[in-house]
Amino acid sequence: IWELKKDVYVVELDWYPDAPGEMVVLTCDTPEEDGITWTLDQSSEVLGSGKTLTIQVKEFGDAGQYTCHKGGEVLSHSLLLLHKKEDGIWSTDILKDQKEPKNKTFLRCEAKNYSGRFTCWWLTTISTDLTFSVKSSRGSSDPQGVTCGAATLSAERVRGDNKEYEYSVECQEDSACPAAEESLPIEVMVDAVHKLKYENYTSSFFIRDIIKPDPPKNLQLKPLKNSRQVEVSWEYPDTWSTPHSYFSLTFCVQVQGKSKREKKDRVFTDKTSATVICRKNASISVRAQDRYYSSSWSEWASVPCS
Amino acid sequence: RNLPVATPDPGMFPCLHHSQNLLRAVSNMLQKARQTLEFYPCTSEEIDHEDITKDKTSTVEACLPLELTKNESCLNSRETSFITNGSCLASRKTSFMMALCLSSIYEDLKMYQVEFKTMNAKLLMDPKRQIFLDQNMLAVIDELMQALNFNSETVPQKSSLEEPDFYKTKIKLCILLHAFRIRAVTIDRVMSYLNAS
C-alpha cells in the first residue's frame, strides 16, 4: 500500500480468482483513543471499532472511502483504490491501446519544434468518474524539471457503438536548449483513476523523435507565362524553431488529381518553392519534415490548381 | 529569415556537401546495424545514450547559432579552446567562435574515427562475421576531416590484448552509431547555418 495523495491510498493486488488479497491497517487521524467506529462509503454499518481498523482487501467491494467517527462526528477519511496486477503485468483497463506506432501505445506525444514544449494525448471509452494527473521529467535517476498543465478533454468521437474520449496535456521542459543533443529521454507519467481503480501509464521519448512540424504556411501559386507550369511557394510555419538556416526543413510537393486513383506527382526539395505542372481539377499540397533528422512529416497544406 | 539550402557551391562552403554525405552514411550504417543486429539491443529505446566526446569537445556550445546565445539554457560551458587554422573558413573575417566551432567538429570526427577503426578491427576477428563498418562511412569521415584541415595531434589507434567480447562490441557499435548520428545532425545544422551566414 502506498499514498497517492493526502488520505488517498493505493493497494496493489495480485489479481486472480480466490486470491488472498492484502491485509491493510487503517489508522484514524485523531488524538482520540476510544469510542471510535469505522464505516465504508455511504453505509452506516459499523465495520469495527478502535483507533485502527484491519481489513483484508481482495476486490473492489473492499475498496472505497473508510471513515472513522466518534459520537456522530467524522474524525478522518482514508480512500482506498485498487491497482490490479494481472499475471505480473499492471492492468490497462482505463486507456485504449492506440496501436500506433506500435502495440501497447497508450500515450502519444508530439512536439512542433525543439523548444522543449510538447503535447501528449490518450483515449478512453469511459465518460464519468475519471481523473488524470500528469507528471514529467527529463531522465529518471536524477530527474530534471518538466512542467505539465492539467489534462483536459480535447475531443469526443463516435466509434461504432462506442463514444471515444480524447484527453490531452501540454508540458514544457523548464530549461530547454533547442540545439541541445538529448542523451536522457523525457519521461511522462499519467495516473488514471476510474471509480476505485488506479492505473498508471508511462511514455519515454526524445523530443527529436516526436517532432512533427506544423504545415507550411502561405502556400501560393504563380502561373508561369505560356506554360502549364506554376511556381508553388510557401514559408516555414511560425511555430518552427529558429534560425531556419540551422533548423532547416525539407519539403514534399504533391500534385493530386480529384480522383484518389489518379497518379500522384511528388517532388522533394529543400527550397521554399518548386515548379510543377498544374492539372485541371487537381490540387497542390506541401508538407514539411526536419531536413536532418527524419521524424514525422507535417500534415499537408493544400491549394486548388484552379 | 528563411534561407533554404540549394545544392552548395563547393567554393563557397566546401564542408556543407561533406557533412551531408556524412549524415547519409551514418544513417545508412545505423539502419544496417539495427537490421543485422535484430537480436541485440540496438534501438534508440534500448541502448544507453553515451557521448564519447563529453567533456572533451563542446561542439553544441561552440557552434551555437548567434540567435540562441540569448537562451541561457544553451550556455552551459563555452570555455573549451581549440586550434584555429581550418580551410573550411571561406572568409578571412571568420570569427574566433566559428574557428572554435569547426575545430570542435574536427576533434569529434577524429575521436569517432579512432573508435570506429578500433571497433572494426575487433569485428573482423568475429567468427560469425556478422557486421563490419561501412568503408564508405569511414571514407566520408576522412573527407570531412580533410576539408576541415586542422593541424592536430594524431590519436593512436587503441589496441587491446584481451580476447574481444563480440556481444559487447556489437552493443557498443550500436551506442556509437546512435551518438554519432546525433552529432552528424548537429554538424549538418551547423554547416547549413554557416553556409547561409
Epitope: D14, W15, P17, D18, D87, G88, N103 | -
Partner: antibody, heavy 115, light 111 residues
C-alpha cells in the same frame, strides 16, 4: 472453490459451426479476464482467444481470427467460444482458463472436425 | 508459430536433477515473467511455477524455476516417477499481450 465446467464439444463437419461454453463458479466471474487454449492430439498448447473482464476487448490468435468469436455473459457467469467455418486443423481439446498469476483450467472438451 | 523453444525430451533416473530450458527473446521472456505447467496424460495443465520462480501452495519444493535474460529454466531436483509428464513454459510478448505464448513442450521421462 473456483470451478470451470466446459460443454459443447463434439464431432462436426468441415465448414460447420460449434459453440463451446464454460460455466464458472466459486469466484466473481465478472472481475476477471478469460482465455481459450487448445491442444491438438499429440501436440502442444496453443492460445486461441482472450476476453477482458467486462467484454470490452477481445484478442485472437491469427489462426482463428475472423472465424472464432469469444464472448461472455457475466449475468450467467459463462464464457463462450463460437467457432465457424471449422477446419480439420481445428481438431483439438479446448480449455477455458482464468487470467492471472494463479490460474484455473476447465476440464477440457474435445472438438473433432471431420467429414 | 512457437516463439519459446524447449527441448523435445529430457530424462533422468529417480533422485536425479533434471532441468528443462525455455529460450525466448527480448520482447517476451526478456520483458515479462515466465510460468511453468505440468500436464499429465488426459488432464488439463497444472501450474507449477509463476512469476519466474514462485511456487503455488501445494507444489512440491523439488520444483524450482529461474530466469536469466531471454531464457528460463525449470529444475526438478530428485525427480520421481510421478513427475513423468509433459512440461510447458509460458510467457507474454510485450506487443501482443494478453496473448499467451507457450513453449514447444518437453516430455520428461523417468527411467
Amino acid at each position: 472453490q473456483v470451478q470451470l465446467v466446459q460443454s459443447g464439444g463434439g464431432v462436426v463437419q468441415p465448414g460447420r459451426s460449434l459453440r463451446l461454453s464454460c460455466a464458472a463458479s466459486g469466484f466473481t466471474f465478472s472481475s476477471y479476464g478469460m482465455h481459450w487454449v487448445r491442444q491438438a492430439p499429440g501436440k502442444g498448447l496453443e492460445w486461441v482467444a482472450f476476453i477482458r473482464y467486462d467484454g470490452s476487448n477481445k484478442y485472437y490468435a491469427d489462426s482463428v481470427k475472423g472465424r472464432f468469436t469469444i464472448s461472455r455473459d457475466n449475468s450467467k457467469n459463462t464464457l463462450y467460444l463460437q467457432m465457424k467455418s471449422l477446419r480439420a486443423e481445428d481438431t483439438a481439446v479446448y480449455y477455458c482458463k482464468t487470467h492471472g498469476s494463479h490460474d484455473n483450467w476447465g476440464q477440457g472438451t474435445m472438438v473433432t472436425v471431420s467429414s | 508459430s512457437y516463439v519459446l523453444t524447449q527441448p523435445p525430451s529430457v530424462s533422468g533416473t529417480p533422485g536425479q536433477r533434471v532441468t528443462i530450458s525455455c529460450s525466448g527473446g527480448r520482447s517476451n521472456i526478456g520483458y515479462n515473467t515466465v510460468k511453468w505447467y505440468q500436464q499429465l496424460p488426459g488432464t488439463a495443465p497444472k501450474l507449477l511455477i509463476y512469476g519466474n520462480d514462485q511456487r503455488p501452495s501445494g507444489v512440491p519444493d523439488r520444483f524450482s524455476g529461474s530466469k536469466s535474460g531471454t531464457s528460463a529454466s525449470l529444475a526438478i531436483t530428485g525427480v520421481q516417477a510421478e513427475d513423468e509428464a509433459d512440461y510447458y513454459c509460458q510467457s507474454y510478448d510485450r506487443g501482443t499481450h494478453p496473448a499467451l505464448l507457450f513453449g514447444t513442450g518437453t516430455k520428461v521421462t523417468v527411467l
